[in-house]
Interface confidence: low
Amino acid sequence: LYFSRDAYWEKLYVDQAAGTPLLYVHALRDAPEEVPSFRLGQHLYGTYRTRLHENNWICIQEDTGLLYLNRSLDHSSWEKLSVRNRGFPLLTVYLKVFLSPTSLREGECQWPGCARVYFSFFNTSFPACSSLKPRELCFPETRPSFRIRENRPPGTFHQFRLLPVQFLCPNISVAYRLLEGEGLPFRCAPDSLEVSTRWALDREQREKYELVAVCTVHAGAREEVVMVPFPVTVYDEDDSAPTFPAGVDTASAVVEFKRKEDTVVATLRVFDADVVPASGELVRRYTSTLLPGDTWAQQTFRVEHWPNETSVQANGSFVRATVHDYRLVLNRNLSISENRTMQLAVLVNDSDFQGPGAGVLLLHFNVSVLPVSLHLPSTYSLSVSRRARRFAQIGKVCVENCQAFSGINVQYKLHSSGANCSTLGVVTSAEDTSGILFVNDTKALRRPKCAELHYMVVATDQQTSRQAQAQLLVTVEGSYVAEEAGCPLSCAVSKRRLECEECGGLGSPTGRCEWRQGDGKGITRNFSTCSPSTKTCPDGHCDVVETQDINICPQDCLRGSIVGGHEPGEPRGIKAGYGTCNCFPEEEKCFCEPEDIQDPLCDELCR
C-alpha cells in the first residue's frame, strides 16, 4: 500500500463544527488483495516541525481515509497551540497519516507509508458561501500532484470535492471533469467525483501525465469555469531487464602503447529502461563482477560501472532511462614485454529485477595485449649554434610511437665519443616519453675542435631494461660572440623588445632572447614577453628542461607571486596576462602591466 500523494492541503477555520469533513487521503494497492487501513499520528506539528500538542481535534476514518473534525477548533484551542509555536505566528499545522500495517515510528514520515496533511489556519469563522470565489469553491490553494507506481492494480487516488464547501454550502453546485486525450488511463466518476486509474500504468511508456482538471460552478444563474493543472507522475519499479543496445555484448580491444594503470581499454554499454535503483543505491544493487578465470586477467583488469540517466522516446513522450557504461580498466601498468590474448566475461546483475526473465547479462571483452618493441631511427642529425646558452633546447629524440605511450617509462642517455666535447644533455619528458636534447656545457661548445659532436643515444625501458640505440650527429655552427655586459641571467627580466633582443639568457638556442608580441586583447594567453625561445617558452607548461633552472622560463615555472592582471597557471606560472609580463626569478615575482605605447618607436627616435 502507498499514498498517492506525500502531502495534502486543506483550510481550517475557527469554530468549524465537530463532524465537519475535511478531506480524503487515498492509498493505492501494491497487490490486489491489499486493504488500506489508515491511522493518524498522535501529534499536531507547527512551524519548523515543532511538536505543538497531542492531536485532539482531527480524526480519520480507518477504512475510507476521511479526515474530519471530532471537535471544534475554538479560539482557546488555537491560542494553546500558538503559544507552543516558538513565538512564530501559527499559520499552518500538520498531521501525519500512516498506512497500517506499516509500523513507522511517529517521528518519521516518509512516502510511501506516510503522508503529511497540512492545514492553513484562518483565525476567522468559515466565510459566507456567497463570498467564496469560484477558485475557492473548486480547488485547494496548493495544487495537488500525484504519484502512482507502475504495474500496480488500478484504484482511486483523488476526490475532487472540497468537503467543507460541500458540507457548508450545499446549495452551490460544483461539477468536475478531466480534460484528457483519448485512451488515457484515468477516469473521473461523475457521481462520486473520484479520480481513478483504469488500468495499471507503465512508466516505460509514459512517465508524466499533464492533465487539466475543469471545475464548473453553478450558483443560481451564474456559471463559472476554473481550470487547474492535474499532474500525475508514474513511479518506477525495477521491471525491465538490462539489455545490450543494438545487441552489442562484445567489445574487442588492443592494448599496445597505452599501458598505464587506469587506462580504459574498452567500454560496453548496457541499457535499462528503468531509473531504479536510485543513484545512492545503484552501485550496490546493480552489480558487475569480472568472472573468475585467468588469474593474470583478474589482477590486470577491473571493471568500472558508470551509470547515467538518459531519456528515450516512447509513444510520443520522453521517459527517463539508464545507460550503464562498463569500462574495462587496466589495474596496473603493463610492461612492454607482456603479450597475451584473452576473453574476459563480466556478469552484470540487476539484483532488484524480479522478472520475467533474468536480470543478468554477460559482457564479453576480447583483449589482446601486444608487446612493444623499442626502435630508434638509425641516425639523428642536428645542428647547434656556438652561441647557444646553457639549457637551450636543440631537439628531441623519441622511440617509435613514443607520443602515443602511456605507462611506459623510457629513459634516454647520451654516450659521447669525445670526452672533451660532451656538450649536450638529455632529459626524458614525462608527457610524451621523448628525450629533450639540451645544451649542458657551453664551454665545450665553444672549443674549435668540437665542431662535430658524436653521440650514441640509448633509450631504456625502465621496467624490462630493453634498449634501443641510435647515432646522434650534431654540427656546431657559427662563431661565438660574447654578449654585452649587464645582461640578466633570465630573458624574462626584460620588459621591452629592444633590451630583450640585445641580450641572451639561459635556455636561448641562438644566444639571443626573443620577443613575443602579444595580441593586446586584455588578459590573454598571448601576452607580450621576452623568452629564450618562443617555441618552448612560454607555452603554459613548465617542461622538464625548464624545471632545471627557474631563470629559463619563469613565465611557465614560477611558483611565486604575480602582480597585475593575470590568470595563474595550473599548477604554476602565468596562464594568461595583461599587456607585458616580465619576471624576476630571484625575487620569485612576475609583473603583468599594460604595454608601454612609446616603446619601440620612442627608443628608435631617441637614439
Epitope: 563482477t289 573468475p292 578465470g293 588469474t295 586477467a297 597475451r340 556478469l347 533474468a358 543478468v360 554477460l362
Partner: antibody, heavy 125, light 107 residues
Framework: EVNLEESGGGLVQPGGSMKLSCVAS????????MNWVRQSPEKGLEWVAD??????????HYAESVNGRFTISRDDSTSSVYLQMNNLRAEDTGIYYC????????????????WGQGTSVTVSS | DIVMTQSHKFMSTSVGDRVSITCKAS??????VAWYQQKPGQSPKLLIY???TRHTGVPDRFTGVGSGTDYSLTISSVQAEDLALYYC?????????FGGGTKLEIK
Amino acid sequence: EVNLEESGGGLVQPGGSMKLSCVASGFTFSNYWMNWVRQSPEKGLEWVADISLKSNNYGTHYAESVNGRFTISRDDSTSSVYLQMNNLRAEDTGIYYCAVYYYGVKFYYFVLGYWGQGTSVTVSS
Amino acid sequence: DIVMTQSHKFMSTSVGDRVSITCKASQDVSTAVAWYQQKPGQSPKLLIYWGSTRHTGVPDRFTGVGSGTDYSLTISSVQAEDLALYYCQQHYNIPWTFGGGTKLEIK
C-alpha cells in the same frame, strides 16, 4: 562428438606418485580449458585443477587440498591433459574425471560441459 | 571457499510428478549455479548453468531458478530416466564447489 578418455589409475601406497592421462577427441582441444574432478563416497564431487590455453600461458588453478602436490599439464599436439600426483594420501582415493569447460557462443562458462568416464585411484598400504 | 548445501540427500517421487531439488550457497553467487545429473555407473552430465540456462539437448522439463544464495532445479514431470543423483555447483568463484548431491528415487 566430444570424447574424453582417462587412464593411469590404479593402486598406490601413501606417499607414492601416479600420473593420470586424458586423451580428447571430437573438438578442437587447443581452444578449451581442461579440468580434473574427482569423486569419492566420503567427499562427493570435488574439483581438483584446471589448465587454460596457450594464449593464457597455460595458467593453472588448484584446489587447496592438492596445491603443491598435484600438477596439471597439457599437450595440445596430442590433445592430452595430464595430472601428476605426488605424495598421495588416503583421502585422494576416488574416481578421477577429466572434464572440459563448456564453451558457449561467446565465452567459456566455468561449468563442466563434458566429462570422461573416469579412472579409479586407490591410495592404500 | 563457497559452500554449496543440498539439504535433501534423497527425494522420493513418482513418474509424472513435479519435483524441486534445492541448493543453498554460503554467500551470494549472483546466479552462477550449475546443475548436473549423474546416473548410476556414469559420469555427471551438465543440465543447467547460470542458474537457469539449459545446456544443449537438455529437455525443457528441467528448469533452474534462483538468485542470491537460494537455487532450485525443478523437473516438471518426472520420467523414469530422470532417476539419478543431482548435484549443484557454483561457478561464481574458484575453487568451484559442488553440493553433496540429492538422489531422486521412485516410490
